[in-house]
């Protein structure tokens, strides 16, 4: 018995088509993925064959400005219209808290939504309960196939879930769940979820009686043979894995930002053994046309985001410098003001020893691509970040040893001068650099905010410790030069829309007034 | 829990027809075909034929002219038809899962006078 | 129709050893080889599919290797239970089996 598992992953808001690089589609002609795409191409495998399951392994929510405005809405609505049969909860699913779930996308999805590692408690349980589950028993033709959730743990620290989700052990919590399957006598299990390649490898070794693996959180491009773009593949497509207990446990993921469709078939023999599995991500490209109900509907809900554009946000009542002139040769308020931002986004007190998870930002200067002038009645809209930070990346979280943190800061000023982008804006850090000093010997201090403590203050750098920090996705994926920071992390978890986080802290704060204040002396 | 079982007779005379039912559970003949395998005394197994999930059947070329496999999924049997028996014949007879991943206990049926 | 060759047709062997029985196909099957184990009077019993996925329940000192043509049932330490009749079975094409191999108490 054949099974056809289609699935993407980490869509975050690309509900439009987007250029090869998942920014803006600019020249239609060469734009790729998009909801209305993604529909043909789905409902032409439908057509073609028997037995189909469409799923997604979470973060459907944060990244552009369809989420910023409808909230998680637009997810429910076009899922719904694609017709998927199940989700995964990704750690992005709540950044806008608990009721940023239940109201737009719990309530609203006609699918089930998944995850058996999160458990409910106090007044939240009875709230909650029902409109997620830990699996669900699908029927496909004349068989069944058990789909069971997993979400990250490590949630707490990278949303909004609040206090009365409990967020377990992946593996602790999915056997038992697995093992009720079972007794169900559902031999064909599949483990959805959102957790990053490395667990998911591990649910496929660990996790007794689950026989294929779809997951995301990492972005993981796996692909077998010649790859189609510009994404490097990780291993091939599926990724096997031999489980424990001898069996070959297929592991897939497709990439991020609805770029592919990830395309498994399954051989399943009667005990719902893996008897062979074969595939490929499918490029979304334009080669595939934009199924036009779905796009006429893209349009109309397409307009609302166009207003939203050039409503006020907060006033600034101050000029913020986001020259190059400033901001690649020395601090910047703009970079203060984008960091403070960050580090605003990324509070989350989960242990009373710690104010904050995190207290450090860096920036490399050549991101920020635009000033602000106060001298519009103090005004700030989308549309002016949007060309403060045209790329639509993310803020992401990572840990570095303090070493590296050190190699980042010398790369930051080694060929100073010269305008050039790796300068790197601050926040939580304060540095001295002598620039009469060699390249590579620059750095004369540099000092770090604390975490664990009440009352933040400044500490020097200590090489072997591990430190978190916000920074852009294009430096932790070694942008700018910054390899060492590619090579050398020790985690990397992504985060929100860089626009979004900006917006929000200013939409808080109503009023900024962002100084120069001696982060970069 | 998947298993099989085939039934029939144990005794047929020479010339007649064999007709022996695999009674399926734990699984649906709609999503899965069914393997007919035999083994004469002391020698080696040998393929007959399979029923597929969608109805067609092939056969060993050995048996084509004499073997018939059909089955009634409503009822979860899948029945072979062996005509013009010979002593030859004599053999266990199984069915077996499509992928083999389950086999009936098999039933010995001998061709004698 | 593919040719499945097995070796060796039997063997001695002591409880503790290492048994090796390898099964040569004809053409290219693409891994899909079946071990079986048959006792006298039992059913017969698949032990590993998809050349090296373990069954449920079968003890981890079987171990199935090979592609291509070549393939490999591999019983890392031999216990008494083990003493029984092993066959390949390719379903690549119509089903073909190995001519089996008796594995024996030396």
């Known amino acids: 018995w054949e099974l056809t598992i289609l699935h993407t992953n980490d869509v975050h808001s690309r509900l439009e088509q987007t250029s090869e690089d998942s920014s803006k589609c600019v020249n239609a002609s060469r734009c790729m993925g998009g909801v209305a795409r993604l529909f043909t191409k789905v409902q032409q495998i439908r057509r073609a064959e028997p037995n189909v399951l469409l799923l997604d392994a979470g973060d459907q929510y944060q990244g552009t400005i369809w989420f910023t405005v409808y909230k998680g809405a637009e997810v429910a609505h076009f899922m719904n219209a694609l017709r998927y049969d199940a989700m995964a909860l990704g750690n992005h699913e709540f950044d806008n808290g608990v009721e940023g779930l239940i109201e737009p996308l719990l309530k609203e999805a006609k699918f089930p939504i998944l995850s058996a590692n999160i458990k409910a408690k106090g007044p939240l349980a009875s709230q909650i309960s029902g409109l997620y589950l830990p699996y669900k028993v699908l029927p496909v033709g004349d068989e069944v196939v058990g789909i069971v959730g997993y979400t990250s743990k490590e949630t707490p620290f990278l949303s909004n879930p609040g206090t009365n989700l409990v967020f377990e052990d992946e593996i602790t919590a999915l056997q038992p769940e697995v093992d009720k399957l079972k007794t169900l006598n559902v031999n064909k299990i599949i483990a959805l979820g959102h957790s990053g390649f490395e667990m998911d490898k591990l649910i496929a070794q660990k996790v007794r009686g689950v026989d294929v693996v779809v997951g995301g959180h990492s972005n993981t491009f796996l692909y077998t043979g010649n790859p189609p773009s510009k994404e490097v593949p990780a291993g091939k497509y599926p990724f096997i894995v031999t489980s424990d207990d001898g069996r070959k446990v297929p592991v897939v993921q497709a990439y991020a930002f609805g770029k592919y469709l990830g395309y498994l078939k399954i051989e399943f023999d009667e005990r719902g053994n893996v008897i062979s599995s074969h595939g490929n991500p499918i490029l979304l490209n334009s080669s595939i046309p934009e199924d036009p109900s779905i796009k006429a509907d893209i349009n109309k809900w397409r307009i609302k985001l166009d207003n939203y554009s050039t409503q006020e946000l907060g006033k600034t009542i101050v000029y913020l410098d986001g020259s190059s002139q400033s901001c690649r040769f020395r601090e910047c308020n703009m970079g203060n003001l984008i960091c403070d931002a960050m580090i605003n986004n990324n509070l989350r007190h989960t242990d009373e020893m710690f104010w904050n998870h995190v207290s450090m930002c860096i920036l490399n200067g050549g991101g920020i691509r635009s000033p602000i002038d106060e001298r519009n009645n103090g005004t700030i809209t989308w549309e002016n970040l949007a060309a403060v930070l045209p790329f639509g990346g993310t803020f992401d979280l990572v840990q570095l040893k303090g070493s590296t943190l050190k190699k980042a800061f010398e790369h930051s000023v080694h060929r100073y001068g010269q305008s050039t982008g790796e300068f790197l804006q601050v926040g939580g850090i304060h540095v001295v650099y002598d620039l009469s000093r060699k390249p590579g010997d620059r750095v004369v201090k540099l000092d770090v905010l604390c975490t664990k403590c009440r009352v933040p203050s400044y500490d020097p750098l200590k090489m072997d410790e591990v430190y978190k920090v916000i920074l852009p996705n294009f430096l932790a994926n070694g942008g700018d030069g910054f390899q060492m920071i590619k090579d050398e992390l020790l985690r990397h978890d992504s985060g929100d829309q860089d626009i979004n986080v900006v917006s929000t802290y200013i939409s808080k704060m109503k009023v900024i007034y962002p100084a120069v204040e001696g982060r970069i002396k | 829990e998947v298993t099989l079982k085939e039934s029939g007779p144990v005794l047929v005379k020479p010339t007649e027809t064999l007709t022996l039912t695999c009674t399926v559970s734990g699984f649906s003949l709609s999503s899965y075909g069914i393997q007919w395998v035999r083994q004469p005394p002391g020698k080696l197994l040998e393929w007959l034929g399979v029923?597929?999930?969608?109805?067609?059947?092939d056969y060993n070329a050995a048996f084509i002219s004499r073997l018939t496999i059909s089955k009634d999924t409503s009822k979860s049997q899948v029945v072979l038809t062996m005509t013009n028996m010979d002593p030859v014949d004599t053999a266990t007879y199984y069915c077996?899962?499509?992928?083999?991943?389950?086999w009936g206990q098999g039933t010995l049926v001998t061709v004698s006078s | 129709d593919i040719q499945m060759t097995q070796s060796p047709s039997s063997l001695s062997a002591s409880v503790g050893d290492r048994v090796t029985i390898t099964c040569r196909a004809s053409q290219d099957i693409g891994d899909r080889l079946n071990w079986l184990q048959q006792k006298p009077g039992k059913a017969i019993k698949r032990l590993i599919y998809a050349t090296s996925s373990l069954d449920s329940g079968v003890p981890k000192r079987f171990s199935g290797s090979g592609s291509g043509t070549e393939y490999t049932l591999t019983i890392s330490s031999l216990q008494p239970e083990d003493f029984a009749t092993y066959y390949c079975?390719?379903?690549?094409?119509?089903?073909?089996f190995g001519g089996g191999t008796k594995v024996e108490i030396k």
């Open positions: 079975l390719q379903y690549a094409g119509s089903w073909t």
């Open positions: 077996a899962g499509q992928y083999g991943s389950v």
């Open positions: 029923i597929w999930s969608g109805g067609s059947a």
